[in-house]
């Protein structure tokens, strides 16, 4: 079937997920499109431990994640509940700032140089991280 039991080439396995780290930038929607074509999604950060893992791999570089509020409320791309989930915003963020002069506010979340999150204009060409979960069935211990 289509179940994934190990990570593809050039992806990094961590805690039963696979991660791919870009080395160049795209707008949020185009990064999202890239991940989806690879049967993945922009990274969804669900714990401090996952935050530190991603932060270690991306370094001090603005990097898109799978969090946006383009349709109103903040939403994770995989449906993970935002309100009750892990958050790591910078102080005073998100602020939906309109002062950048690019039109509109700021609807897409990214890791900043210190790893904490900021909302920014979705058209900015930032690096991104894709994530895909390994097949849940493969987590079961083998039958003896």
């Amino acid at each position: 079937g289509s179940e994934r039991t190990c990570c593809p080439v050039n992806w990094v396995e961590h805690e039963r997920s696979c991660y791919w780290f870009s080395r160049s930038g795209k707008a949020w929607a185009d990064a999202d499109n890239y991940c989806r074509l690879e049967d993945a999604h922009l990274v969804v950060v669900t714990s401090w431990e996952e935050q530190k893992f991603v932060q270690h791999h991306i370094g001090p570089v603005n990097t898109w994640m799978g969090l946006h509020d383009q349709n109103g409320p903040w939403k994770w791309v995989d449906g993970t509940d935002y309100e009750t989930g892990f958050k790591n915003w910078r102080p005073e963020q998100p602020d939906d700032w309109y002062g950048h002069g690019l039109g509109g506010g700021e609807d897409c979340a990214h890791f900043t140089d210190d790893g904490r999150w900021n909302d920014d204009v979705c058209q900015r060409p930032y690096r991104w991280v894709c994530e895909t979960e390994l097949d849940k069935a493969s987590q079961e211990p083998p039958l003896l």
Partner: antibody, heavy 122, light 107 residues
Framework: EVQLVESGGGLVKPGGSLRLSCAAS????????MVWVRQAPGKGLEWVSS????????DYADSVKGRFTISRDNAKNSLYLQMNSLRAEDTAVYYC???????????????WGRGTLVTVSS | EIVLTQSPATLSLSPGERATLSCRAS??????LAWYQQKPGQAPRLLIY???KRATGIPARFSGSGSGTDFTLTISSLEPEDFAVYYC?????????FGGGTKVEIK
């Protein structure tokens, strides 16, 4: 041999339907996104549709949205394009292509079939 | 949608000469640009990706350069088999798009 072979093209009247197939061999078909690209006679190349590895994500050019359906069968190493409500402007050679990825995050067509001609005319 | 404009439309050269093909994007595509070669009756073939990286099996006489909006494909010394149509393609912004092509013909 690493190759893609398209079939299913032909002459069809406006409003008609066709189903194109693409048979893959020589590589792990189930590990790559795939696309259809077309080329009208004497014209340039136009992306038509993309499909992710397990078909969980599908995308279409505006010009074919709602009329064409892309699908794949990884067990059969095959890619398909169902074309309905065909128009004269859909006349083209249709190529299937493998979508290769790069470390920078680019998607490029690193393997192409030889194409199949679709002619829409009354 | 990003528009890619290729120039010249036709390039008439002799074998052994240097060919310089241009591709200009309507907005920045960073380095997400590829070049393809297509001979009559054949499928396109990937030559260059990420603006400057040669695809597997492509001879060293083909080179790509540029970033942002201006890109160049150079064929250092034309071989008889290089006379064909060349297309650029961007994968920076959705939808991915192709240029209109440059035909390299024998002078």
């Amino acid at each position: 041999e690493v190759q893609l072979v398209e079939s299913g093209g032909g002459l069809v009247k406006p409003g008609g339907s066709l189903r194109l197939s693409c048979a893959a061999s020589g590589f792990t078909f189930s590990s790559y996104p795939m696309v259809w690209v077309r080329q009208a006679p004497g014209k340039g190349l136009e992306w038509v549709s993309s499909i992710s590895i397990s078909a969980s994500y599908i995308d279409y050019a505006d010009s074919v949205k709602g009329r064409f359906t892309i699908s794949r069968d990884n067990a059969k190493n095959s890619l398909y394009l169902q074309m309905n409500s065909l128009r004269a402007e859909d006349t083209a050679v249709y190529y299937c292509a493998k979508l290769g990825t790069t470390v920078s995050g680019g998607h490029y067509f690193d393997l192409w079939g030889r194409g199949t001609l679709v002619t829409v005319s009354s | 949608e990003i528009v890619l404009t290729q120039s010249p439309a036709t390039l008439s050269l002799s074998p052994g000469e240097r060919a310089t093909l241009s591709c200009r994007a309507s907005q920045s595509v960073s380095s997400y640009l590829a070049w393809y070669q297509q001979k009559p009756g054949q499928a396109p073939r990937l030559l260059i990706y990420d603006a400057s990286k040669r695809a597997t099996g492509i001879p060293a006489r083909f080179s790509g350069s540029g970033s942002g909006t201006d890109f160049t494909l150079t064929i250092s010394s034309l071989e008889p088999e290089d006379f064909a149509v060349y297309y650029c393609q961007q994968d920076s912004n959705h939808p991915l798009t192709f240029g209109g092509g440059t035909k390299v013909e024998i002078k």
